[in-house]
């Protein structure tokens, strides 16, 4: 009899068998019948081992071994063994942020009887591989719960029968798609032509971000460093060298593994600052013994729309005015508390029209006509007085909360023209005639 038939190794087309027989008689001939669904064939050997060749991959073979000595046949013994399936090939992967759909091919005749074992391993984390086994004959699988923007390796073994696997797996590296940034916020930087962008890191891994800033024909593309989504930190970057009070289209794209996510877009407007001081000074002309006419051009709106103008008069030295003068009124002047005061306030938005950057408006103010604008009284001027005029332009005008109607110079965004040349008022004609 033959016993302990042992399959030493098996490949796709070969099988090496050995066995034992009860006595050591060397004159035994062993007859083998090799049967599969493709048919059967016979072979003999004097050895207690044989290598069967030319087999078909993934096929179940029944091997019956019968000993014979001097034409006397002993009891046969059998074993059943599959050859290994061929390795899978042509692995194709399509991904989204958290899943990968894999498909592959196996060209064996027996492939309709194969199932496939997939091992999915995140790069640098071999201890935590995911295993998926397909149904018989299925050559695709979707793996879910993956991490966005991350690198994975998949190994695919074909298997048949009771877990007889292909010798080598088909291997493929792939990356999941990076996750887009959910959104980002823009903050203006006070008195700076800049924007601060803030975001929380998108889930998964990233190599960095592409930042695109665009306004009209101007654009700028730059890279941003990578971030980590693990601790929910808020990330920020400052975009500088912009223009004041300008709308910008901003796009941020996550990058990982050489892949780019869908861009996240926002439209943001930069802040304002003090207007650029005008080159010229106002034009002042005497109208009567107690009034003058002040003419000036609107300030340039490149640092933000001009919200208001204040006409300032002084009888003193014409130094460069500061925001401090904005607190003085006609009453202060009359009391001798200041030789400089605000006589008139113009709120430009009351004109009901927007001013473009290049459009320069002309203003003509009658000073001394006893009108009142907010907390400022446009009182009569002193006959024979010598007056100079200056104009303050505001991109942001703030009023004292406790001093109703008076400008808070420190909190406002303001710049000043130079003082005009002095104009001397004539004598009051009533005094001459008197």
């Amino acid at each position: 009899a033959v016993f302990d038939i042992h399959v030493v190794y098996v490949t796709t087309t070969e099988m090496w068998l050995d066995w034992k027989s009860p006595d050591g008689a060397s004159e035994y001939v062993y007859h083998l019948v090799i049967e599969s669904k493709h048919g059967s064939n016979h072979t003999s050997t004097y050895d207690k081992a044989i290598t069967l060749q030319g087999l078909i991959p993934g096929t179940l073979y029944n091997i019956t071994i019968s000993p014979e000595v001097d034409h006397v046949w002993g009891d046969p013994n059998s074993t059943a063994q599959y050859t290994r399936p061929s390795n899978v090939s042509n692995i194709d992967v399509s991904t989204n942020t958290t899943a990968a759909t894999l498909s592959w091919q196996n060209f064996d005749d027996a492939s309709p009887t194969y199932s496939y074992c997939l091992l999915i391993e995140k790069a640098g984390n071999s201890s935590n591989a995911t295993q998926v086994v397909t149904d018989i004959g299925i050559t695709d699988a979707t793996v879910t719960e993956l991490i966005p923007g991350s690198s994975y390796t998949v190994e695919i073994f074909a298997q048949v029968g009771d877990g007889i696997k292909s010798l080598e797996p088909g291997r493929k590296s792939f990356c999941t798609d990076p996750a887009s940034m959910a959104s980002f916020d823009c903050e203006v930087v006070p008195k700076e032509p800049a924007l601060v962008l803030k975001w929380t890191c998108p889930p998964g891994a990233n190599a960095g971000f592409e930042l695109e800033v665009s306004s009209g024909a101007w654009n700028n593309a730059t890279h941003l460093e990578s971030c980590s989504s693990e601790n929910g930190t808020e990330y920020r970057t400052e975009v500088t060298y912009l223009n004041f009070s300008t709308s910008y289209n901003i796009s941020i794209t996550t990058v990982s593994c050489g892949k780019m996510a869908a861009p996240t877009r926002n439209t943001c407007t930069t802040g304002i600052t003090d207007p650029p001081p005008p080159d010229g000074s106002p034009n002042i002309t005497s109208v009567s013994h107690n009034s003058v006419k002040v003419k000036f051009s609107g300030f340039e709106a490149s640092h933000g729309p001009i919200k208001a103008y204040a006409v300032i008069l002084t009888t003193g030295e014409a130094g460069h005015p500061s925001a401090d003068v904005l607190k003085y009124t006609y009453e202060d002047f009359k009391k001798g508390a200041s030789d400089t005061y605000v006589t008139y306030l113009i709120r430009t938005e009351e004109k009901g029209r927007s001013q473009s950057l290049s459009e320069v408006l002309k203003y003509e103010i009658d000073v001394g006509n006893e009108s009142t604008t907010l907390g400022y009284y446009n009182g009569k001027l002193e006959p024979l007085g010598s007056y100079r005029a200056c104009v303050a332009g505001f991109t942001n005008i703030t009023f004292h909360p406790q001093n109703k109607g008076l400008i808070d110079g420190a909190e406002s965004y303001v710049s000043f023209s130079r003082y005009s040349d002095a104009v001397s008022l004539p004598q009051d004609p009533g005094v001459i005639c008197g």
């Epitope: 190599a207 592409e210 665009s214 654009n219 794209t253 780019m260 861009p263």
Partner: antibody
Framework: EVKLVESGGGLVQPGRSLKLSCAAS????????MAWVRQAPTKGLEWVAY????????YYRDSVKGRFTISRDNAKSTLYLQMDSLRSEDTATYYC??????????WGQGTLVTVSS | DIQMTQTPHSLSASLGETVSIECLAS??????LAWYQQKPGKSPQLLIS???PLHDGVPSRFSGSGSGTQFSLKIRNMQPEDEGVYYC?????????FGAGTKLELT
């Protein structure tokens, strides 16, 4: 699998125009920054032009500025390079490429442009 | 423009040897450096981006290092298929610029 296929190259006289195309497949074309890179015969590589994904902003090397125009049609997943006023020094194989974070990741097979009278 | 100086211009190595190619940027480029391999008549292929991450499918015998202005590409256990021209490239600032290339041959 990312696939980029350039076309439109050929022999052209100096001063004339040529339009190259790059058909993209296997990825979401509209998400990607794209570029053209060229290589003169037996020479090194030279970046030519670049276009962003968000607002289609464009950038060019100085020697082609004003003569070349990069554009994209996201609906057709196609990148273009319009080359006007061609010069003999523009003779090269032109490749299109995806460009995340300044690295030319995926390349086409290239199309040869020969500028000669 | 940022100049990328690659050394050596050419080198030959025997099977199994380790080779190094250096790249020097004329100004700091953070880690925005990529390495490419080009074989005759073929398109360049990305090997390494952002100074050290290996691109998908590139054998692990390739490695990159460096940041700022000095970078290097190391190929351990030289194989016949590693023959070709290697280029470094900065993607930090326009115009993006390449090194002149290093021709690697098998001895």
């Amino acid at each position: 699998e990312v696939k980029l296929v350039e076309s439109g190259g050929g022999l052209v006289q100096p001063g004339r125009s040529l339009k190259l195309s790059c058909a993209a497949s296997g990825f979401t074309f509209s998400n990607y920054y794209m570029a053209w890179v060229r290589q003169a015969p037996t020479k090194g590589l030279e970046w030519v032009a670049y276009i962003t994904n968000g607002f289609g902003s464009t950038y060019y090397r100085d020697s082609v500025k004003g003569r070349f125009t990069i554009s994209r049609d996201n609906a057709k997943s196609t990148l273009y390079l319009q080359m006007d006023s061609l010069r003999s020094e523009d003779t090269a194989t032109y490749y299109c490429s995806t460009v995340p974070l300044g690295a030319f990741v995926s390349w086409g097979q290239g199309t040869l442009v020969t500028v000669s009278s | 423009d940022i100049q990328m100086t690659q050394t050596p211009h050419s080198l030959s190595a025997s099977l199994g040897e380790t080779v190094s190619i250096e790249c020097l940027a004329s100004e700091g480029i953070s880690n925005y450096l990529a390495w490419y391999q080009q074989k005759p008549g073929k398109s360049p292929q990305l090997l390494i981006s952002y100074a050290n991450p290996l691109h998908d499918g590139v054998p692990s015998r390739f490695s990159g290092s460096g940041s700022g202005t000095q970078f290097s590409l190391k190929i351990r256990n030289m194989q016949p298929e590693d023959e070709g021209v290697y280029y470094c490239q900065q993607g930090y600032k326009f115009p993006y610029t390449f090194g002149a290339g290093t021709k690697l041959e098998l001895t």
